[in-house]
Amino acid sequence: HNTTVFQGVAGQSLQVSCPYDSMKHWGRRKAWCRQLGEKGPCQRVVSTHNLWLLSFLRRWNGSTAITDDTLGGTLTITLRNLQPHDAGLYQCQSLHGSEADTLRKVLVEVLADPLDHRDAGDLWFPGESESFEDAHVEHSISRSLLEGEIPFPPTS
């Protein structure tokens, strides 16, 4: 899996989207977990509704919400009131039994509020930036990546 970078501004909300094959993952609940180090476990933050048919209902754990569009094949995580401690490595997961398949590896980066001149440095518009091996990137970032630069090393 490549790592997708999502950048948000402290104090604001950040939406993370994880697309998946809706047929392949039919009937499976989803989860959002925090990677505790490159080789550490992925600690569950929040998971979708216990009843898969109700996965569209937003579930909260603290300031993190999850909702699943099972027909469209998009898992959406919302991090409300983003703060520096939210920065880190995460995974979107598809659950089956006691196993979990990784849908997407995510790096969340938290930028200081650009209106708060006390702490802001050089700020580009935040959002989603996904890198592929051919250096394609999405949305607004300050530069493209070099070929093969981002593929993330195995976590186990």
């Epitope: 401690h85 920065a87 880190g88 930028l111 702490d119 970032i141 630069e149 090393p153």
Partner: antibody, heavy 118, light 107 residues
Framework: QVQLVQSGAEVKKPGASVKVSCKAS????????ISWVRQAPGQGLEWMGW????????NYAQKLQGRVTMTTDTSTSTAYMELRSLRSDDTAVYYC???????????WGQGTLVTVSS | EIVLTQSPATLSLSPGERATLSCRAS??????LAWYQQKPGQAPRLLIY???NRATGIPARFSGSGSGTDFTLTISSLEPEDFAVYYC?????????FGGGTKVEIK
């Protein structure tokens, strides 16, 4: 294994600039940011700021705003911290750290002593 | 800016004794507080994150507690290698800040 190797000690005159480098290895450079922390002789730790190795976005500490610039070179997996208009109270050991200085698998450089003296 | 105040500044203890270090925040940082150990000539080493979770490879004699504004780092039985300076750090809000440190020295 993860390693951050910093450039050597520097002696600078007041008003000059210094640029400290931090070369990373053992992990995918752009999958983490780099923080800079400094420590004056016999004093505590001071967070200077952070740079995203992914796209160069930065957060700087207020007191250094306008004097500090953090950059990265992804082709060499190296981060740089430049501090301008040096004063004697900038004399410190400067550390780079992987991540926003609070990741669970934090890694630090060995430190670079910058001495500002006339 | 959140100010972290550590006490005492110096703690004089003997090996085998229990060390209790305090860190107080000027406003709530929830549980987003870390503890570091630093020995002379070395970079800081992460001991505790999120107030009470031990970092990888940190011995069980180190424990952290607290939330909001008051935090404690406890070393249950001091080993010779534990004599060092300890810093707390908050990552609740920008700018990230450190406490002034507590030096644990041999009595």
């Amino acid at each position: 294994q993860v390693q951050l190797v910093q450039s050597g000690a520097e002696v600078k005159k007041p008003g000059a600039s210094v640029k400290v480098s931090c070369k990373a290895s053992g992990y995918t450079f752009t999958s983490y940011g780099i923080s800079w922390v400094r420590q004056a002789p016999g004093q505590g730790l001071e967070w200077m700021g952070w740079i995203s190795a992914y796209n160069g976005n930065t957060n700087y500490a207020q007191k250094l705003q306008g004097r500090v610039t953090m950059t990265t070179d992804t082709s060499t997996s190296t981060a740089y911290m430049e501090l301008r208009s040096l004063r004697s109270d900038d004399t410190a050991v400067y550390y780079c750290a992987r991540g926003p200085s609070h990741y669970y698998d934090l890694a630090w450089g060995q430190g670079t002593l910058v001495t500002v003296s006339s | 800016e959140i100010v972290l105040t550590q006490s005492p500044a110096t703690l004089s203890l003997s090996p085998g004794e229990r060390a209790t270090l305090s860190c107080r925040a000027s406003q709530s940082v929830s549980s987003y507080l870390a503890w570091y150990q630093q020995k002379p000539g070395q970079a800081p080493r992460l001991l505790i994150y999120d107030a009470s979770n031990r970092a990888t490879g940190i011995p069980a004699r180190f424990s952290g507690s607290g939330s909001g504004t008051d935090f404690t780092l406890t070393i249950s039985s001091l080993e010779p290698e534990d004599f060092a300076v300890y810093y707390c750090q908050q990552v609740s809000n920008y700018p990230i800040t450190f406490g002034g440190g507590t030096k644990v020295e041999i009595k």
